[in-house]
C-alpha cells in the first residue's frame, strides 16, 4: 500500500470560449481508494478555488460553466490525488481559453453536382458553421477543411478552404459515389471532428478534366 502516483492534466477543451472542460489521468492508486480534486487560481490572483463541476465532463474531469469562464485570464490549475498513505500533485497547467477551443463539426453539409451549359460540370459543397459559435462578435475566425474520396478508395483528398463556407471541385471520376465531409477550427485552436459524411453519386456523363 502506497501513496497515489502523480496525476496528469492531459487535455482542456472549449466548444466556444464560453465554457471549458479539463481532463486528467490518474497515477497509480497505491492499492487504496483515492480521491481527486482539481484546484485553480487565475493569473494575478492568489485565492485558490476548487473545481466547480466534477460531473458534466465525465470521470476525471472538471467542467467550468459560463460563470467560471473568462477569456481574458489565464487559469493555473493542478490536480491533487489523496489516499490513506498520502498525497501527490500534478504539475501545474496554464490554460488560456482562447487557445483550447475545439468547436462542434459544421452543420448542414450539402453536396450537389452542377452542370452549367456553358462551363465544365463541378461538385458544389456548402455548409454552415456550428450553432454554438457566434461569428458575429468577431471573437472567432473559423477555418474549414473538406475531405472527399470515392466510396471504395482508401485515401481521402483533403482541401483547406479558409473561411469560406462553400467549395468547388471540378475533376471527379464519372459514375462513382463520393463521400464528402467538412470540419472547422478557430484560428487559434483545434480541429473539430469531421461532420457526418454526405454521399453524392457522380453522373456517368460528368466531364473528368478541366
Amino acid at each position: 500500500q502506497l501513496p497515489p502516483g502523480k496525476p496528469e492534466i492531459f487535455k482542456c477543451r472549449s466548444p466556444n470560449k464560453e465554457t471549458f472542460t479539463c481532463w486528467w489521468r490518474p497515477g497509480t492508486d497505491g492499492g487504496l481508494p483515492t480521491n481527486y480534486s482539481l484546484t485553480y487560481h487565475r493569473e494575478g490572483e492568489t485565492l485558490m478555488h476548487e473545481c466547480p463541476d466534477y460531473i458534466t465532463g465525465g470521470p476525471n474531469s472538471c467542467h467550468f460553466g459560463k460563470q467560471y469562464t473568462s477569456m481574458w485570464r489565464t487559469y493555473i490549475m493542478m490536480v491533487n490525488a489523496t489516499n490513506q498513505m498520502g498525497s501527490s500533485f500534478s504539475d501545474e497547467l496554464y490554460v488560456d481559453v482562447t487557445y483550447i477551443v475545439q468547436p462542434d463539426p459544421p452543420l448542414e453539409l450539402a453536396v450537389e453536382v452542377k452542370q452549367p451549359e456553358d462551363r465544365k460540370p463541378y461538385l458544389w459543397i456548402k455548409w454552415s458553421p456550428p450553432t454554438l459559435i457566434d461569428l458575429k462578435t468577431g471573437w472567432f475566425t473559423l477555418l474549414y477543411e473538406i475531405r472527399l474520396k470515392p466510396e471504395k478508395a482508401a485515401e481521402w483528398e483533403i482541401h483547406f478552404a479558409g473561411q469560406q463556407t462553400e467549395f468547388k471541385i471540378l475533376s471527379l471520376h464519372p459514375g462513382q459515389k463520393y463521400l464528402v465531409q467538412v470540419r472547422c477550427k478557430p484560428d487559434h485552436g483545434y480541429w473539430s471532428a469531421w461532420s457526418p459524411a454526405t454521399f453524392i453519386q457522380i453522373p456517368s456523363d460528368f466531364t473528368m478534366n478541366d
Epitope: 482541401h159 483547406f160 479558409g162 473561411q163 469560406q164 471541385i169
Partner: antibody, heavy 118, light 111 residues
Amino acid sequence: EVQLLESGGGLVQPGGSLRLSCAASGFTFSSYWWHWVRQAPGKGLEWVSDIARASSYTNYADSVKGRFTISRDNSKNTLYLQMNSLRAEDTAVYYCARGLDARRMDYWGQGTLVTVTS
Amino acid sequence: QSVLTQPPSASGTPGQRVTISCTGSSSNIGYGYVVHWYQQLPGTAPKLLIYRNNWRPSGVPDRFSGSKSGTSASLAISGLRSEDEADYYCAAWDDSLNGWLFGGGTKLTVL
C-alpha cells in the same frame, strides 16, 4: 483567353517599398483565389501569399509576414502586393497566379522583377 | 521544419520513362492534402502540369502522370522528349505553416 499581367517591379533600396499589380482579363476575376509566388535568381519557387475570393481571408509565408500585404479589387480585376521594409533577400521575379478548386495555380503571369540593393 | 524534398536533378534519354519524387511529412502530403506539379521551361513562367495528385489539365499529354502514397508523391514522364527538359516542382498546403510549400525543384535533362 486568360491573361495575367504583372507590373510595379523595379529597383529599390533596402527598407524601401513597392506595390505590385496583376491585371487579369478573359474570365471572371472575382470567382478565384489569387496567389503571389516568387523566384529568386537561379533558385526555386517560393509561395508568398494568397487571398480568398471574399478578400477577408489571407495567408502569408513566414518570411514576409508583417511586411507584405495582399489585396484585390474585384471591380478592377486586379490583384496587388504591397511590399514594405524590403530586404536584399526579397530580390526575385514575382508571379501572380490564379487559384482554382484546390487552390491549384492554374494560370500564371509572366512575372515582374524586384531588385533590392543599396 | 516543414519541407517537400525533391531530387535536384534527373535525366533520361528520349523515349525513356523518368520518375521524380516529392517527399513531405505528416503536416502536408501525409496529412492528406493534395499535391500539384508544375513545369517551368527555361526562361518562362511555371505551368500547371498535374493537379490534385493525379489529374491532368487539358492540353497536358498523357505521357505525364502523378501519384501519391503516404507522405510522398511522384511525377512520372514516359516517352521522354527533348521538349520535356525543364524544372519540375511539387507543391502542397502545409497545416503547421498554414501556407503553401514548394519542393526545391528537379532539373530534368534529356540526354
